[in-house]
């Protein structure tokens, strides 16, 4: 008889057939699982209270242009030893200059600009997703230039400002991902190739689904955008009765595949092979890796039962994917 067939190329794109959402898992409401990762928002990331920042600056305003002593040359590291006895009170100093708020604001902007520069030096590529981009843009008109002294004096202010402003590159938003489980047991006859389908979205903490493309009924995940996808499948397998009740032969094995367009050899695929000669009646087989999918290409999970006995893939076995990047 013919071999269980092959893989392929890019195809005519069509919308997935109906059934993209159904069936739902046990106890899952129409609105979908309750536990879902929150959508990241720009507002929530790196929030710095403007008033707190300003007040800190004003409290530190005896430094910088208001400093009693302008440091020259390199910044000196502060060394803290044992405190000495209190000295005599010094003479009354001359009244300090009245610094108008505009000047304070200008220096505050300079400090912010320095923080942004520090962030840019620390990052190999500028990050456009965080708030630093807009801040830097808004500071562009400031005409004063910060000298070396300013860099030295404002270390503690920078420490406060640079931390929320430049925590390093933000993790990118995941645009496409899912975790689904097999709804019911699937029987796989001996010497047969079986494509898994009929999944559900678990209503559980940590489960996720983001973006379109997953057809729960067909078991096919159609890439919503072209890119690198991390894919994984874990099957819980129960061995059935072998014919003539013989033990598994040394050549008996299972192949678990995640394939593109139902073409496991012609296209790149992920594959795990497991010998059955020493396996127990219930075991797990897993495969994971990364595939590049064109937009509209689909992937699905296949189990090739190259053994002499039938087996059952248990419900709860799972299939997942995450778009890593484009």
């Amino acid at each position: 008889s013919p071999e269980p067939g092959a893989p392929s190329r890019s195809r005519a794109r069509r919308e997935p057939p109906p059934g993209n959402e159904l069936p739902r898992g046990p106890g899952e409401s129409r609105a979908g699982p309750a536990a879902r990762p929150p959508e990241p928002t720009a507002e929530r990331a790196h929030s710095v209270d403007p008033r707190d920042a300003w007040m800190l600056f004003v409290r530190q305003s005896d430094k910088g242009v208001n400093g009693k002593k302008r440091s020259r040359g390199k910044a000196k590291k502060l060394k803290f030893g044992l405190p000495g006895p209190p000295g005599p009170p010094g003479p009354q100093g001359p009244p300090g200059p009245i610094i108008p708020p505009e000047a304070l604001l200008k220096e505050f902007q300079l400090l912010l600009k320095g923080a942004v520069r520090q962030r840019e030096r620390a990052e190999p590529e500028p990050c456009t997703c965080g708030p630093a981009g807009p801040v830097a843009a808004s500071l562009a008109p400031v005409s004063a230039t910060a000298g070396e002294d300013d860099d030295d004096v404002v270390g503690d202010v920078l420490a406060l400002l640079a931390a929320p402003l430049a925590p390093g590159p933000r993790a990118p938003r995941v645009e496409a991902a899912f975790l689904c489980r097999l709804r019911r047991d699937a029987l796989v006859e001996r010497r047969a190739l079986h494509e898994l389908g009929v999944y559900y979205l678990p209503d559980a903490e940590g489960a996720f689904r983001r973006g379109p493309g997953l057809n729960l009924t067909s078991g096919q995940y159609r890439a919503p955008v072209a890119g690198f996808y991390a894919l994984a499948a874990t099957l819980h397998v129960a061995l059935g009765e072998p014919p003539r009740r013989g033990p598994p032969r040394p050549r008996d094995h299972l192949r678990l595949l995640i394939c593109i367009q139902s073409r496991c050899q012609r296209n790149a695929s992920l594959e795990a092979i497991m010998g059955l000669e020493s396996s127990s009646e219930l075991f797990t087989i897993s495969v994971n890796g990364v595939l590049y999918l064109q937009m509209g290409q689909w992937t699905s999970v296949f189990l090739d039962n190259a053994s002499g006995c039938s087996l059952t893939v248990r419900s709860g076995s799972h299939f997942s994917a995450v778009l890593l990047g484009v």
């Epitope: 067939g5 190329r9 067909s218 394939c259 367009q261 496991c264």
Partner: antibody, heavy 119, light 106 residues
Framework: QVQLQQPGSVLVRPGASVKLSCKAS????????MHWAKQRPGQGLEWIGE????????NHNEKFKGKATLTVDTSSNTAYVDLSSLTSEDSAVYYC????????????WGAGTTVTVSS | QIVLTQSPAIMSASPGQKVTLTCSAS?????MNWVQQKSGTSPKRWIY???KLASGVPARFSGSGSGTSYSLTISSVEAEDAATYYC?????????FGGGTKLEIK
């Protein structure tokens, strides 16, 4: 038994249409690509197109666009090719063939349907 | 589209003779398949993935090649091998067949 069943022959009038069937049995019809090929008497094989029963995706040979339409009925495990505006050039044997999944190429062929276009 | 040229169009061989059928592609292909078709019957998968024998194909058959040049070889031809052999490429749409080589046994 894994097989593809096709009617033996059909006679049609010029200008008419005909829908050829290919009934699959012995395997999971929806998982495999189904292809159609044409062979004129004494000549070679021409690939018409392919359809995936589960996804509904199709690809055609440009030469047969407007001539051949591929469809499936998953409830009866049957693939169809609809040939329109028939002329004598369409007189040929039409084969359905299953593409393998873990190998490359057609791993199973139907016996073919002979289409005769004649008035 | 990729054009496949088979040669010779007709070949006559005596039993026990070694026979090589060739298939030349107009541009490079990754996989070449061969199908066998006997008169009045449907094609059968014969060699796939360039060199793998389909189930039931005698070991005297072999396939090889890469790029634009592929071949099917019968180490010691037998009477039952009389048929037309087509090469077919799977690298790009539309999938194309060669014109076929008709093998006759003397």
């Amino acid at each position: 038994q894994v097989q593809l069943q096709q009617p033996g022959s059909v006679l049609v009038r010029p200008g008419a249409s005909v829908k050829l069937s290919c009934k699959a049995s012995g395997y999971t019809f929806t998982s495999y690509w189904m292809h159609w090929a044409k062979q004129r008497p004494g000549q070679g094989l021409e690939w018409i197109g392919e359809i995936h029963p589960k996804s509904g995706d199709t690809n055609h040979n440009e030469k047969f666009k407007g001539k051949a339409t591929l469809t499936v009925d998953t409830s009866s495990n049957t693939a169809y090719v609809d040939l329109s505006s028939l002329t004598s050039e369409d007189s040929a044997v039409y084969y359905c063939a299953r593409e393998g999944i873990t190998t490359v190429g057609f791993d199973l062929w139907g016996a073919g349907t002979t289409v005769t276009v004649s008035s | 589209q990729i054009v496949l040229t088979q040669s010779p169009a007709i070949m006559s061989a005596s039993p026990g003779q070694k026979v090589t059928l060739t298939c030349s592609a107009s541009s490079s292909v990754s996989y070449m398949n061969w199908v066998q078709q006997k008169s009045g019957t449907s094609p059968k998968r014969w060699i796939y993935d360039t060199s793998k024998l389909a189930s039931g194909v005698p070991a005297r058959f072999s396939g090889s090649g890469s790029g634009t040049s592929y071949s099917l070889t019968i180490s010691s031809v037998e009477a039952e091998d009389a048929a037309t052999y087509y090469c077919q490429q799977w690298s790009s749409h539309p999938y194309t067949f060669g014109g076929g080589t008709k093998l006759e046994i003397k």
